[in-house]
Interface confidence: low
């Protein structure tokens, strides 16, 4: 079967790094600098991306793969293959269309992306609060308040007024 | 006129499967590298995989990989996507679109793709 194809097609012959070109008897031409073909008997190069920008290099391209790109320092990625980069915040902060707000009283974010999301609210599991939230912590829940040993006491905070998601403008 | 037609959407529940097909017509169908995308309601299209002119090279977003498998029959003009366990966020309205010869863009970008089908639904739900 692949000889019989080879015969029909003799662009399936061309390897990887290489495309049929059409313009020259469909002999196999080394991709053009700047472009690849990741499989053989490619008709055309795919051009290779380029990292510019606020995107730089995480893998260089070769004539059979595409380069890599990932963000530069303060930017994370977003998307599939790293096709956006987004601003980092601090800790305690989120990304709103006017930049980084700090996260409302009651919230809390641990990383330098996404929302601020509410914190945990103990009592739902029967829990009390044993170390208050933060802007960057979420509260940690120890046990209930029957649990506690006489004159143990525990801080419970109010709760969040606000939906997730959103930072005082 | 270039025309790209998907089918086989429907409902399904989680753990199952659906084989989706997009028919061309209106070009050179063979010459292309085509891809299937997807977009939930209120999200961005996402790329799902792509499958080169001559079925040689894939590339699959990671979070399908191993669940979801194009393929390509260039003499029926017709692009397939066999997807199994599915799972509700793999809810979304799912197209397909052909490749440009050449493109600046990644190709998991819908930049790289010109021409697009008009979608078929996939619903996973219990």
């Known amino acids: 079967f692949e000889r019989t194809r080879s015969l029909q097609d003799p662009c399936s012959n061309c390897p990887a790094g290489t495309f049929c070109d059409n313009n020259r008897n469909q002999i196999c031409s080394p991709c053009p600098p700047n472009s690849f073909s990741s499989a053989g008997g490619q008709r055309t190069c795919d051009i290779c991306r380029q990292c510019k920008g606020v995107f730089r290099t995480r893998k260089e391209c070769s004539s059979t793969s595409n380069a890599e790109c990932d963000c530069t320092p303060g930017f994370h990625c977003l998307g599939a293959g790293c096709s956006m980069c987004e601003q980092d915040c601090k800790q305690g902060q989120e990304l709103t269309k006017k930049g980084c707000k700090d996260c409302c009283f009651g919230t809390f974010n641990d990383q330098k992306r996404g929302i601020c999301r509410p914190w945990t609210n103990c009592s739902l599991d029967g829990k009390s609060v044993l170390v208050n939230g933060t802007k960057e912590r979420d509260v940690v829940c120890g046990p209930s308040p029957a649990d506690l040993s006489p004159g143990a006491s525990s801080v419970t905070p109010p709760a969040p007024a606000r939906e997730p998601g959103h930072s005082p403008q | 006129e270039v025309q790209l037609l998907e089918s086989g959407g429907g409902e399904v529940q989680p753990g199952g499967s659906l084989r989706l097909s997009c028919a061309a017509s209106g070009w050179a169908f063979g010459n292309y590298g085509m891809a299937w995308f997807r977009q939930a309601p209120g999200k961005e299209r996402e790329f799902i995989g792509r499958?080169?002119?001559?079925?040689?090279?894939?590339d699959y977003v990671e979070s399908v990989k191993g669940r979801f498998t194009i393929s390509r029959d260039n003499p029926k003009n017709t692009l397939y996507l066999q997807m199994s366990s599915l799972r509700a966020e793999d809810t979304a309205v799912y197209y397909c679109?052909?490749?440009?010869?050449?493109?600046?863009?990644?190709?998991?970008?819908?930049?790289?793709?010109?021409?697009w089908g008009q979608g078929t639904l996939v619903t996973v739900k219990p």
């Open positions: 679109a052909r490749q440009r010869s050449y493109s600046r863009y990644d190709i998991r970008t819908p930049q790289t793709y010109d021409y």
């Open positions: 499958l080169a002119w001559n079925g040689g090279s894939t």
